[in-house]
């Protein structure tokens, strides 16, 4: 029986050009974690395997960094990075757990907009 739960950072926002850490945490289970997959809208970004460690998909190597922990760091963010991200935990004997994070990448901060358009 699957007793575990995944806690995620939920809905997050970050600035274009910046970086963000995606984090998931599996709790309430003693299941062995075989692997964690990170996906963005049907694309595999990275894998953290219990035996082999990290594998980053070639098309994301420049902008994705492993960690911290089982998390994933996205760098040099663009507006196109806005969307759903999923952490998929492969465990035994429970099976597969999925967590969802929604990332919104903003053009620039409100503070910058305010400064740029200040009336003298």
């Amino acid at each position: 029986m699957m007793t575990g739960t995944i806690e995620t950072t939920g809905n997050i926002s970050a600035e274009k050009g910046g970086s963000i850490i995606l984090q998931c945490h599996l709790s309430s289970t003693t299941a062995q974690v075989t692997q964690v997959n990170w996906e963005q809208q049907d694309q595999l970004l990275a894998i953290c395997n219990a035996d082999l460690g990290w594998h980053i998909s070639p098309s994301f190597k420049d902008r994705v960094a492993p960690g911290p922990g089982l998390g994933l760091t996205l760098q040099s963010l663009t507006v196109n990075d806005t969307g759903e991200y999923f952490c998929i935990y492969h465990t035994y004997p429970d099976g597969t757990y999925t967590g969802r994070i929604f990332l919104e990448v903003l053009e620039s901060s409100v503070a910058e907009h305010g400064a740029r358009f200040q009336i003298p």
């Epitope: 699957m2 075989t34 894998i47 395997n49 594998h55 492969h90 035994y92 429970d94 099976g95 597969t96």
Partner: antibody, heavy 119, light 107 residues
Framework: EVQLVESGGVLVKPGGSLKLSCAAS????????MSWVRQTPEKRLEWVAT????????YYPDSVKGRFTISRDNAKNILYLQMSSLRSEDTALYYC????????????WGQGTSVTVSS | DIQMTQTTSSLSASLGDRVTITCRAS??????LNWYQQKPDGTVKLLIY???RLHSGVPSRFSGSGSGTDYSLTISNLEQEDIATYFC?????????FGGGTKVEIK
């Protein structure tokens, strides 16, 4: 080209033991999770065992736990299934399978080796 | 254990037909559903994984869909080489389990 070639299937008496082998080629064997899946005479498919890429973890269904042992030799690119205390219900065609790196599915299967448990 | 049910054990269709094979899980499997093809000679190939992702080298006439407990495999334009038995498999919860198979034959 990915190739998985099973061997070792024979006729064995109930209570007996048997070791199946699967020779892998055409890919970096040590990077992949591997499994054994069997097909019964009634054509039902059943997952039998799984081993992680480095051999650190092994997983089994209750039906074979304590009787079957999956292992691997990454230097020789061979997957094994040691079967003991065999029962008539273990009669099946045994397939060696490779898992996708994502672990979502088994992407390559061997041709199978036949095991018959009968007195 | 999760039971996987393929209610149609065999079906006959004509070449060029659109064929749909269904699979039902006894509980929600969150799209962790795969489809395999077994040819009459016993050769097994992965067609679709994670409900709708086409495995590399598989013709685009194959597609998968579904959610929750109900899933389907569609062959949009049946060809002679598609004569085979099709199995679904869930990868949500151990032990991973398979459907009983659906044999596709030519009318």
């Amino acid at each position: 080209e990915v190739q998985l070639v099973e061997s070792g299937g024979v006729l064995v008496k109930p209570g007996g033991s048997l070791k199946l082998s699967c020779a892998a080629s055409g890919f970096t064997f040590s990077n992949y999770v591997m499994s054994w899946v069997r097909q019964t005479p009634e054509k039902r498919l059943e997952w039998v065992a799984t081993i992680t890429s480095g051999g650190t973890y092994t997983y089994y269904p209750d039906s074979v736990k304590g009787r079957f042992t999956i292992s691997r030799d990454n230097a020789k690119n061979i997957l094994y299934l040691q079967m003991s205390s065999l029962r008539s219900e273990d009669t099946a065609l045994y397939y060696c399978t490779r898992w996708l790196l994502s672990l979502y599915a088994m992407d390559y299967w061997g041709q199978g080796t036949s095991v018959t448990v009968s007195s | 254990d999760i039971q996987m049910t393929q209610t149609t054990s065999s079906l006959s269709a004509s070449l060029g037909d659109r064929v749909t094979i269904t699979c039902r899980a006894s509980q929600d499997i969150s799209n962790f559903l795969n489809w395999y093809q077994q040819k009459p000679d016993g050769t097994v190939k992965l067609l679709i994984y994670y409900t709708s992702r086409l495995h590399s080298g598989v013709p685009s006439r194959f597609s998968g869909s579904g959610s929750g407990t109900d899933y389907s495999l569609t062959i949009s334009n049946l060809e002679q080489e598609d004569i085979a038995t099709y199995f679904c498999q869930q990868g949500k919860t151990y032990p991973y389990t398979f459907g009983g198979g659906t044999k596709v034959e030519i009318k």
